[in-house]
Each structure stands twice: as structure tokens, then as C-alpha cells.
């Protein structure tokens, strides 16, 4: 599990159609 102090920071991954975008790229979400 993530440490408590990390919980408000996003995790970033490559994906397609993520982060309200139609193409492929990096997407960071909490």
C-alpha cells in the first residue's frame, strides 16, 4: 500500500483514451 503522505499525489501511466483525451499519452490520476 502507498504511504499516507503519498495518497494525494497522482500515479502516472501511459494509456489511450484516458484523462479526457482521445489519443494515447501519459495520464496522471490520484
Amino acid at each position: 500500500r502507498r504511504r499516507r503522505r503519498d495518497t494525494h499525489f497522482p500515479i502516472c501511466i501511459f494509456c489511450c483514451g484516458c484523462c479526457h483525451r482521445s489519443k494515447c499519452g501519459m495520464c496522471c490520476k490520484t
Epitope: 502507498r2 503519498d6 499525489f9 497522482p10 500515479i11 502516472c12 501511466i13 501511459f14 489511450c16 484523462c19 479526457h20 483525451r21 489519443k23 494515447c24 499519452g25 501519459m26 495520464c27 496522471c28 490520476k29
Partner: antibody, heavy 121, light 106 residues
């Protein structure tokens, strides 16, 4: 103003280690992903590694995986690149670069001036 | 993955320069473009295919569809002479730069 300043480069023998630093100023360092990108003499740009907001969320190019380690100290506004088992082909100018702000940080919007690493016997 | 750029492009002052960046399904991912002058660090000129960072002149524009992204410089000026690199993500561990294009303003 927004600035990235690399240091720690130099001449090192094959198989040895070196640690690069990148001091950030003028922005909230912890709010940005940070990259290392290198450029061999007379050649193009090559991505090396990225570390995102959480220190455990990091990725490496295949060419350096297992030899290089990217890390950050948000309290010191500093990015690091620990380079072990150096090879002649690692000779390059090493740039630190800031990832764009926001949910979709595809591009590198701020670059440092670079620090030269020469691996030679 | 590879992104292929022409090694060099020449243009007369005031004319339009187009620099291409070709790669497998390039149009399905976001392209960024960087300008690098001799002895200097790269500068971001286009991101997310078509967007210009603040401070970048309007003469710089971009497009991306099919297998090719294109950087267009309209009304090219002498100060635009530089190397230009495209860049795209292919996975979380695979950021790819093109080989670079040397733009010469004749």
C-alpha cells in the same frame, strides 16, 4: 524565474559510478514529474528516465534499466541520477527536464543547461 | 519504435518550412516538437500535436494524423535556423525522439 541546473558530470572510467544532480527553482518542485534526457556528442536526444510525483512511480529506458536510478528530494528541490556500471556509450550531455503540469504531461516544458558525462579509460 | 525525420530541410526567409515525423500509428498518440540551437538546450515549441507554449511565435504550428506528425513554420526567419526534434510516448517506459532535422534558412 523557473530554472533547472544540473551538476555532477565529469570524466569517469568504464564500470565506475557517477551521481548527477539537478537543482530546481522558481516553481513548486513536488508538483511536477521530472525526466533525464541525454544527448551523445553530435547525436540526437535520448530519453533516460522519469520520476513522477510519488517517488516510487518511476520508469527507465531499456538501455539504462538496472544500471541507473532516478530519485528526488522534494524538500531540497533536487532531482538525482545515480549511474552505475558506466559504459562508453553512456557518454553524453545529460539534461534534466520538467514534465508539463496537469493530468496529461506528455511534453518536457523546461530544460536545464546540461552536464557532460564522459566515460573513457 | 522509431520516429523518422528528414536529416535536413532548407527554406528561404519568409517561406514556409515543413518538417515531418513518421512512425507507426503516430496519429494515435500525441506529438511534441523541440527546437535546439547549437550549444543550447532544447525548447518546447509544440505539444499535444497543435498547441503552442506561451512565448512561442504564432508562425509555429503542428498537425498529426495517420503515420505522420508535421511541424510547420510559416514566414520562416533566420532565427528559426536550428535542429528540430519530434517526440512521442509509446509506453510508460518508452519515450521516443525523432532523429532530428537541421533547418537551414538560406
Amino acid at each position: 524565474q523557473v530554472q533547472l541546473v544540473e551538476s555532477g558530470g565529469g570524466v569517469v572510467q568504464p564500470g565506475r559510478s557517477l551521481r548527477l544532480s539537478c537543482a530546481a527553482s522558481g516553481f513548486t518542485f513536488s508538483n511536477y514529474g521530472m525526466h533525464w534526457v541525454r544527448q551523445a556528442p553530435g547525436k540526437g536526444l535520448e530519453w533516460v528516465a522519469v520520476i513522477w510525483y510519488v517517488g516510487s512511480n518511476k520508469y527507465y529506458a531499456d538501455s539504462v534499466k538496472g544500471r541507473f536510478t532516478i530519485s528526488r528530494d522534494n524538500s531540497k528541490n533536487t532531482l538525482y541520477l545515480q549511474m552505475n556500471s558506466l559504459r562508453a556509450e553512456d557518454t553524453a550531455v545529460y539534461y534534466c527536464a520538467r514534465a508539463q503540469e496537469g493530468m496529461a504531461p506528455d511534453a518536457f516544458d523546461i530544460w536545464g543547461q546540461g552536464t557532460m558525462v564522459t566515460v573513457s579509460s | 519504435y522509431e520516429l523518422t525525420q528528414p536529416p535536413s530541410v532548407s527554406v528561404s526567409p519568409g517561406q514556409t518550412a515543413s518538417i515531418t515525423c513518421s512512425g507507426d500509428k503516430m496519429g494515435e498518440r500525441y506529438a511534441s516538437w523541440y527546437q535546439q540551437k547549437p550549444g543550447q538546450s532544447p525548447i518546447l515549441v509544440i505539444y499535444q500535436d497543435t498547441k503552442r507554449p506561451s512565448g512561442i511565435p504564432e508562425r509555429f504550428s503542428g498537425s498529426n494524423s495517420g503515420n505522420t506528425a508535421t511541424l510547420t513554420i510559416s514566414g520562416t526567419q533566420a532565427m528559426d535556423e536550428a535542429d528540430y526534434y519530434c517526440q512521442a510516448w509509446y509506453s510508460s517506459t518508452n519515450v521516443v525522439f525523432g532523429g532530428g532535422t537541421k533547418l537551414t534558412v538560406l
